[in-house]
Interface confidence: medium
């Protein structure tokens, strides 16, 4: 049998059953999530569920830039340090940097300080690039 690899939308990249879109547009976290949803296919800000997935994403983004943090789909909606993925994925894999989680920082970004492999919390109103994800 020939197994066809699913195709992603133009400008998105494929990895292990998912399509990812890196958008170099400045959006706050909620507007980034709305924009991801607007692309259809059930897209949301990206969940990152393994080191392998994180490494693949990091390598892709590093080909574009290495200095600007990027929103992902992890947030703390109740503001009680109860983090959850916006796409409903289980919050098992964690890759927080050593930075403090305090203050009014309830949305997660991939940090440029460690080549996008670790996460930091930031103010959700901050406007940054963002990463979307969907399963084709």
């Amino acid at each position: 049998d020939i197994i066809m690899r699913p195709s992603c939308a133009p400008g998105w990249f494929y990895h292990k059953s998912n399509c990812y879109g890196y958008f170099r547009k400045l959006r706050n976290w909620s507007d980034a999530e709305l924009e991801c949803q607007s692309y259809g296919n059930g897209a949301h800000l990206a969940s990152i569920l393994s080191l392998k997935e994180a490494s693949t994403i990091a390598e892709y983004i590093s080909g574009y830039q290495r200095s600007q943090p990027i929103w992902i789909g992890l947030h703390d909606p109740q503001k009680r340090q109860q983090w959850q993925w916006i796409d409903g994925a289980m919050y098992l894999y964690r890759s927080w940097s050593g930075k403090s989680m305090g203050g009014n920082k309830h949305c997660a970004e991939m940090s440029s300080n460690n080549n996008f492999l670790t996460w930091s919390s930031n103010e959700c109103n901050k406007r940054q690039h963002f990463l979307c994800k969907y399963r084709p």
Epitope: R24, K25, L26, R27, N28, S30, D31, L34, E35, Q68, E123, N125, R127, H129
Partner: antibody, heavy 123, light 110 residues
Framework: QVQLQQSGPRLVKPSQTLSLTCTVS??????????WSWIRQLPGKGLEWIGY???????YYNPPLKSRVTMSVDTSKNQFSLNLSSVTAADTAVYYC???????????????WGRGTMVTVSS | QSVLTQPPSVSAAPGQKVTISCSGS????????VSWYQQHPGKAPKLMIY???KRPSGVPDRFSGSKSGNSASLDISGLQSEDEADYYC???????????FGTGTKLTVL
Amino acid sequence: QVQLQQSGPRLVKPSQTLSLTCTVSGGSISRGGYYWSWIRQLPGKGLEWIGYIYHSGSTYYNPPLKSRVTMSVDTSKNQFSLNLSSVTAADTAVYYCAREKGGDWEQLVFDHWGRGTMVTVSS
Amino acid sequence: QSVLTQPPSVSAAPGQKVTISCSGSTSNIGNNYVSWYQQHPGKAPKLMIYDVSKRPSGVPDRFSGSKSGNSASLDISGLQSEDEADYYCAAWDDSLSEFLFGTGTKLTVL
């Protein structure tokens, strides 16, 4: 070519609410991913950023003004608005609406401006 | 009171070059992009430089921007009478979580 047309009263009484509207022509307020800002200039002074709004309705206000500022957007009319409550004489200024350039890296870079509305706060 | 400090005024003769400085801190100029605006009396500001050194279309190449550490500069060469205006630098401030304009500089072409 995008143009921003401002409207609203030029005289407001102290303690009342200043209300201004900016109507966008030559482009849709809900397309292109632009953020829309209000900026003011006190008489003989420099520029002060008030805040921005996105077509989704999400806002960010300059912290010193945050408690008195409300912005809204009406995509059907292609316009966005500023309300500044509890005004005093210190709020007398020229108020500008502006559109951000919308690039990949820069934020709050204003490439299109309204002509400005001189608002006087006086009884 | 803005934390982006500019000289109140500068002046030079037509054809000369002038530099307008903008001094800030790590939390604004040091860590963020700088833009520059020109404002003629009674008019709305006009974007002249963004991302430290980029010029929007229509802005003459006599205008150039640069940044070093926590300070930025706007250079105007080959001064012309129409360059006489107020100039403002601008940048986001990470500590204040607000967007700042500089104190403004009045350029006089002698």
